[in-house]
């Protein structure tokens, strides 16, 4: 139940990331740690790296408010779950600083990719026989 709630939140975050991708030119062009090809059992650790990253509005134009609201939503902490707690204690996961740094566009693309991976794993874990490759 708690894990389900978590994944529903991930699905909503995908929409927020997609919205922010429309405003990449209005974001500070800073390079941010962007996990990619995250190893199994380190997904929550990587997720927290994305949430901690200092994504910022460039404070230009009319989009500042909508961008800041979206960034705030991205940073909202999800409810704690056993899976998340278990992974928190995995000392083998890379630190946030060890991930390659990318500009906002690639940062958001990689964030979305991680969210999709987590939802797909969740969906597949409830199902048998439809995974082909």
């Amino acid at each position: 139940q708690g894990q389900d709630r978590h994944m529903i939140r991930m699905r909503q975050l995908i929409d927020i990331v997609d919205q922010l991708k429309n405003y990449v030119n209005d974001l500070v062009p800073e390079f941010l740690p962007a996990p990619e090809d995250v190893e199994t059992n380190c997904e929550w650790s990587a997720f927290s790296c994305f949430q901690k990253a200092q994504l910022k509005s460039a404070n230009t134009g009319n989009n500042e408010r909508i961008i800041n609201v979206s960034i705030k939503k991205l940073k909202r902490k999800p409810p704690s779950t056993n899976a998340g707690r278990r992974q928190k204690h995995r000392l083998t996961c890379p630190s946030c600083d060890s991930y390659e740094k990318k500009p906002p566009k690639e940062f958001l693309e990689r964030f979305k990719s991680l969210l999709q991976k987590m939802i797909h794993q969740h969906l597949s874990s409830r199902t048998h026989g439809s995974e082909d490759s």
């Epitope: 699905r11 999709q116 409830r126």
Partner: antibody
Framework: QVQLQESGPGLVKPSETLSLTCTVS????????WGWIRQPPGKGLEWIGY???????NYNPSLKSRVTISVDTSRNQFSLKLSSVTAADTAVYYC???????????WGQGTLVTVSS | DIQLTQSPSSVSASVGDRVTITCRAS??????LAWYQHKPGKAPKLLIY???SLQSGVPSRFSGSGSGTDFTLTISSLQPEDFATYYC?????????FGGGTKVEIK
């Protein structure tokens, strides 16, 4: 705005292979999930399967033995092959994007494929 | 497979009416339900995902609710462009499945 367009023959003979291509414009196929859904005349929608940008696939078990979905990132296209077709495979075939992994936010208009000799 | 049963299969309504469509799942699917609008010859359109989240660009007269096995799509004030067939889809487990559809017709 992402747009999808199905293309392929509208008539396929029984026992042959149905082949359709979906061309994606207004966005890159190198992220998200890309799926096929069909609707037989007068019936509901049926999910056929999908492929991720990395090439991993999920198929409907009822069709799995006959279905292949592949992706061509260089052409921004993905394809459906359905082998050994029968009249029951006559349907409007839709391609669609799934950003959320399990729901479909952009669809093509659909293409009618009739299986008949 | 998870079966989805929509009711009613069709509904006649007038512009300005409040329309409610229900979708019942054969087993609990938490909030993993989407709603689509489909007009003949057009591409289906995602309205609602995870039971109650409004897809970007969809008018606020559309709303979704429910969890577990019982879900509802509500159109608060029917507009001329809303006459179409509506489908629910479960996103809880593979294979992804759709309801049989509800046709909203002009009274």
């Amino acid at each position: 705005q992402v747009q999808l367009q199905e293309s392929g023959p509208g008539l396929v003979k029984p026992s042959e292979t149905l082949s359709l291509t979906c061309t994606v414009s207004g966005g890159s196929i190198s992220s998200d999930y890309w799926g096929w859904i069909r609707q037989p005349p007068g019936k509901g929608l049926e999910w056929i399967g999908y492929i991720s940008s990395s090439g991993s696939t999920n198929y409907n078990p009822s069709l799995k033995s006959r279905v292949t979905i592949s992706v061509d990132t260089s052409r921004n296209q993905f394809s459906l092959k359905l082998s050994s077709v029968t009249a029951a495979d006559t349907a409007v075939y839709y391609c669609a994007r799934s950003a959320g992994v399990a729901d479909f936010d952009f669809w093509g208009q659909g293409t009618l494929v009739t299986v008949s000799s | 497979d998870i079966q989805l049963t929509q009711s009613p299969s069709s509904v006649s309504a007038s512009v300005g009416d409040r329309v409610t469509i229900t979708c019942r799942a054969s087993q609990g699917i938490s909030s993993w339900l989407a709603w689509y609008q489909h007009k003949p010859g057009k591409a289906p359109k995602l309205l609602i995902y995870v039971a109650s989240s409004l897809q970007s660009g969809v008018p606020s007269r559309f709303s979704g609710s429910g969890s577990g096995t019982d879900f509802t799509l509500t159109i608060s004030s029917l507009q001329p462009e809303d006459f179409a067939t509506y489908y629910c889809q479960q996103a809880s487990s593979f294979p992804l499945t759709f309801g049989g559809g509800t046709k909203v017709e002009i009274k």
